[in-house]
């Protein structure tokens, strides 16, 4: 029961995690125009990894894509692309789990696969998380030292008495949603791997052992407690019991009052 | 069509207080900023403030803030300009102004103006 | 504060011909974000309120005849009318509206030679 909680929260967990990376890589304020302590503009700037958008006081605003690939700096390509592995594997690390989950039954799908695919689920919800938890720390490392080196320059002297003010940026709620979703891919991921370890079937099938008797062939059985003479038919040792030790879970197979608590 | 209606012309005593209306009419009065110019006589313009009549945001020129207050009544689709304890300088036309949107920040329709003047 | 300079104070111009406005700002008006600079141009005509001509350095407003132009970025910008009509005679205000507060040039009245 413990186990497929896990497994279903897990589930649950990653999959709010992966939304939240995919609306993080989507939206525009991953920086935002900073407004304090700066030459207050009625003009409002915030960016993407896509695109850059100015709000007017108005409310009127205008985004412009970035069409450009070469032209664009390379810490940009590298948070873009660690988003997109964050979301490639995220997604089909959901997929997996789909199938990996204890309420749903495939065919005849041994728990032994189930716990590879929950394993494997999970571990690619480590990495997704991960790859978004890195993308946005190096974007905000990037706008860290963008921030105080325009602090540093904030007034850039144009000759004479003409200046012009630099717009420094800041965290916008991009960063902070990125933050979250990928910590809760993680979280959700751990939380898989857990529950892997609740479906994998113990290895304590014992193996048929024969042990021969001075006089007579005889070979014991553990398990189907049968034994018969070693010559003939019998002398295959057949799968009398099946030793994969089979969880709690597995056992209440039928609905029972801990079901239902 | 969009028009911005203001008030009579006002005569005042040094020290007392002004209260300029401006009535809007023709587009979505609590959709559009609202702000304040003056042109003293013979004088250039000076951007007093703003006010978004949808909340009721106000942002002040720091020239006359503690002086100036912009109020709005939603339901008649009227902005106030209150301008306290009045100098000889503060003799000017008053004119309202909606910002347009889309349009750089830029005022699109004025009203008429409305003759401030501080006497004793 | 922003200071606008408008140059020069006064012009008199012959009907039909170019008439050229100058002004410039104390910092620049230009918005790297979207690349446009937030200089409105005004037109005032004696008695009447001023009138919206031109918004983002070169955007004509609706309505405002194609004799009138907008040029310039940063820090210095001019207004072009054309061939002069005499219903151009005016005073033309150039305004910042990019930085708080929002200001205002002094004006250049434009006559008729």
């Known amino acids: 029961m413990a186990v497929t909680a896990c497994q279903g929260l897990g589930f649950v967990v990653s999959l709010i995690g992966i939304a939240g990376i995919i609306a993080a890589t989507c939206m525009d304020q991953w920086s935002t125009q900073d407004l304090y302590n700066n030459p207050v503009t009625a003009v409002f700037n915030y960016q993407g990894l896509w695109r850059s958008c100015v709000r007017e006081s108005s409310g009127f605003t205008e985004c412009r894509g970035y069409f450009t690939l070469l032209g664009l700096p390379a810490m940009l390509q590298a948070v873009r692309a660690l988003m997109i592995v964050g979301i490639v594997l995220g997604a089909i690390g959901l997929l997996v789990s789909i199938f990996a989950l204890k309420c749903i039954r495939i065919g005849s799908m041994e728990d032994s696969a189930k716990a590879n695919m929950t394993l494997t689920s999970g571990i690619m919800f480590i990495v997704s998380g991960l790859c978004a938890i890195a993308g946005v720390s190096v974007f905000a490392n990037m706008l860290v030292t963008n921030f105080w080196m325009s602090t540093a320059n904030m007034y850039t002297g144009m000759g004479g008495m003409v200046q012009t003010v630099q717009t420094r940026y800041t965290f916008g709620a991009a960063l902070f949603v990125g933050w979250v979703a990928g910590g809760l891919t993680l979280i959700g991921g751990v939380m898989m791997c857990i529950a892997c370890r609740g479906l994998a079937p113990e290895e304590t099938n014992y193996k048929a052992v024969s042990y021969h008797a001075s006089g007579h062939s005889v070979a014991y059985k553990p398990g189907g407690f049968k034994a018969s003479t070693g010559f003939g038919s019998n002398t295959k040792n057949k799968k009398i019991y099946d030793g994969g030790a089979r969880t709690e879970d597995e056992v209440q197979s039928y609905p029972s009052k801990h079901d239902y608590v | 069509q969009v028009q911005l209606v203001q008030s009579g012309a006002e005569v005042k005593k040094p020290g007392a207080s002004v209260k300029v209306s401006c009535k809007a009419s023709g587009y979505i009065f609590t959709n559009y900023w609202i702000h304040w110019v003056r042109q003293a006589p013979g004088q250039g313009l000076e951007w007093m403030g703003r006010i978004y009549p949808g909340t009721g945001n106000t942002y002040y020129n720091e020239k006359f803030t503690g002086r100036v207050t912009m109020t709005r009544d939603t339901s008649t689709s009227t902005v106030y300009m209150e301008l306290s304890s009045l100098r000889s300088e503060d003799t000017a036309v008053y004119y309202c102004?909606?910002?347009?949107?889309?349009?750089?920040?830029?005022?699109?329709?004025w009203g008429q103006g409305t003759t401030v003047t501080v006497s004793s | 504060d922003i200071v606008m300079t408008q140059s020069p104070d006064s012009l008199a111009v012959s009907l039909g011909e170019r008439a050229t406005i100058n002004c410039k700002s104390s910092q620049s008006l230009l918005n790297a974000g979207n690349q446009k600079n937030y200089l409105t141009w005004y037109q005032q005509k004696p008695g009447q309120p001023p009138k919206l001509l031109i918004y983002w350095a070169s955007t004509r407003e609706s309505g405002v005849p194609d004799r009138f132009s907008g040029s310039g970025s940063g820090t210095d910008f001019t207004l072009t009318i054309s061939s002069l009509q005499a219903e151009d005679v005016a005073v033309y205000y150039c305004?910042?509206?990019?930085?708080?507060?929002?200001?205002f040039g002094g004006g250049t009245k434009l006559e008729i030679k």
């Open positions: 102004a909606r910002e347009g949107y889309g349009k750089g920040n830029s005022m699109d329709y």
């Open positions: 305004q910042n509206a990019y930085y708080y507060p929002y200001t």
